[in-house]
């Protein structure tokens, strides 16, 4: 065979990934690999992930002679050990006036009265703890409730008898019940006065309210 067909182990170099070829014999060679590679021709990227240092559930992503940590959303930093301040990242993390409190690996919301839930989006059902009298209907409000009374009942909790039931107001007067004590209040038409709107008044006087 001619000299042009002679095998020269390092020409061209069989070493890849930046490896350096060294001829060790007539037909043999050795590759000196760059850090991070191995194999007879430096063809293999060494896996740097075994027993990695990614913490808090971080996932190791192998590189060349190094690795990166892919962190869960609540962690950051080289090894996922730095807490993400969700309160800074999400100014509206807490709703309905709730205050955001950053914590290691997460955050919490301190809700204002009447709201609950992780992000203060749930209106607390005040009716669950309300003491509306049986037979009345509870209406939930924000940090409060109101009782809708059946006929014949009055008061904030519908615990009083409605004094207007007996029609104590005369002469077309309007009867209202005082929600605190259950007593009636007569709003007299023009020309009448008195607790029951039974007394005449001088002309010129307009409506009169009388409590009883």
């Amino acid at each position: 065979a001619g000299s042009d067909s002679l095998y020269v182990p390092c020409a061209p170099s069989p070493c890849v990934n930046g490896g350096t070829c060294r001829q060790t014999g007539d037909f043999t060679f050795e590759c000196n690999c760059l850090p991070g590679f191995e194999g007879s021709t430096c063809e293999r990227n060494i896996d740097d992930c075994p027993n990695h240092r990614c913490q808090n559930g971080g996932v190791c992503v192998d590189g060349v002679n190094t690795y990166n940590c892919r962190c869960p959303p609540q962690w950051t930093g080289q090894f996922c050990t730095e807490d993400v301040d969700e309160c800074l990242l999400q100014p509206n993390a807490c709703q309905n006036g709730g205050t955001c409190a950053n914590r290691n690996g997460g955050y919490g919301c301190v809700c204002v009265n009447g709201w609950s839930g992780d992000d203060c989006s749930e209106n607390i059902d005040d009716c669950a703890f309300a003491s509306c009298t049986p037979g009345s209907t509870c209406i939930d409000r924000v940090a409060s409730f109101s009782c809708m009374c059946p006929e014949g009942k009055a008061g904030l909790l519908c615990h009083l008898d409605d004094a207007c039931i007996s029609n104590p107001c005369h002469k077309g007067a309007l009867c209202d019940t005082n929600p605190l004590n259950g007593q009636y209040i007569c709003t007299c038409p023009q020309g009448y006065k008195g607790a029951d709107c039974t007394e005449d008044v001088d002309e010129g006087n307009s409506h009169h309210h009388h409590h009883h």
Partner: antibody, heavy 117, light 112 residues
Framework: EVQLVQSGAEVKKPGESLKISCKGS????????IHWVRQMPGKGPEWTGY????????KFNEKFKGQATISVDKSSTTAYLQWSSLKASDTAMYYC??????????WGQGTLVTVSS | DVVMTQSPDSLAVSLGERATINCRSS???????????LHWFQQKPGQPPKLLIY???NRFSGVPDRFSGSGSGTDFTLTISSLQAEDVAVYYC?????????FGGGTKVEIK
């Protein structure tokens, strides 16, 4: 509050065995690796190795490989550094540490190991 | 391993004056993720090292603002803008970009 509490000082003779401890509290122990750092008298700190409490996997500085072992007891949230045969050159202050904002953010108070005949 | 060289070995500064400590690495500390993992620690006698600055220039919680860090690549600096009596200690730089993490030899800061 993150706390790492180490066992007390030890005086040993060459060839003796030793196991020192580091108890972690105030955080989720299994979420963080525990490092051991050696500081020889008058010298700077040297990272020795770490253990992953969740798996028990370890990683060592090549310089310290085969000289000591690191283990963990998850139930008591405690990591250990152990020698089977101490040498005079093992005399040093040994710290355990945990990562945080940077490397080795939280440290134990240290365990002084003196090896002398 | 990456060699961390600190200078000077010791430093005497008057109270209220500026103290500057340098740290040089044997190779670039820029990680493949783009960050530079160079940290500074303070160690007082009989105590463990205490993290002051992480990732070149971020002060750790509770660290006074007279401590600041700067630099890039292979050259880094810790500055104490106005030295206080409680700052007397040995200061170490640490790199965690390359395995294994390596500390500098330390710089002792004293009062002149």
């Amino acid at each position: 509050e993150v706390q790492l509490v180490q066992s007390g000082a030890e005086v040993k003779k060459p060839g003796e065995s030793l196991k020192i401890s580091c108890k972690g509290s105030g955080y989720t122990f299994s979420n963080y690796v525990i490092h051991w750092v050696r500081q020889m008298p008058g010298k700077g700190p040297e990272w020795t190795g770490y253990i992953i409490p969740g798996s028990g996997g370890t990683k060592f500085n090549e310089k310290f490989k085969g000289q000591a072992t690191i283990s963990v007891d998850k139930s008591s949230t405690t990591a250990y550094l152990q020698w089977s045969s101490l040498k005079a050159s093992d005399t040093a202050m040994y710290y355990c540490a945990r990562d945080g904002a940077g490397s080795f953010t939280y440290w134990g108070q240290g365990t002084l190991v003196t090896v002398s005949s | 391993d990456v060699v961390m060289t600190q200078s000077p070995d010791s430093l005497a500064v008057s109270l209220g004056e500026r103290a500057t400590i340098n740290c040089r690495s044997s190779q670039s500390l820029v990680h493949s993720d783009g960050n530079t993992y160079l940290h500074w620690f303070q160690q007082k006698p009989g105590q463990p090292p205490k993290l002051l600055i992480y990732r070149i220039s971020n002060r750790f919680s509770g660290v006074p603002d007279r401590f600041s860090g700067s630099g890039s690549g292979t050259d880094f600096t810790l500055t104490i803008s106005s030295l206080q009596a409680e700052d007397v200690a040995v200061y170490y730089c640490l790199q965690s970009t390359h395995f294994p993490d390596t500390f500098g030899g330390g710089t002792k800061v004293e009062i002149k």
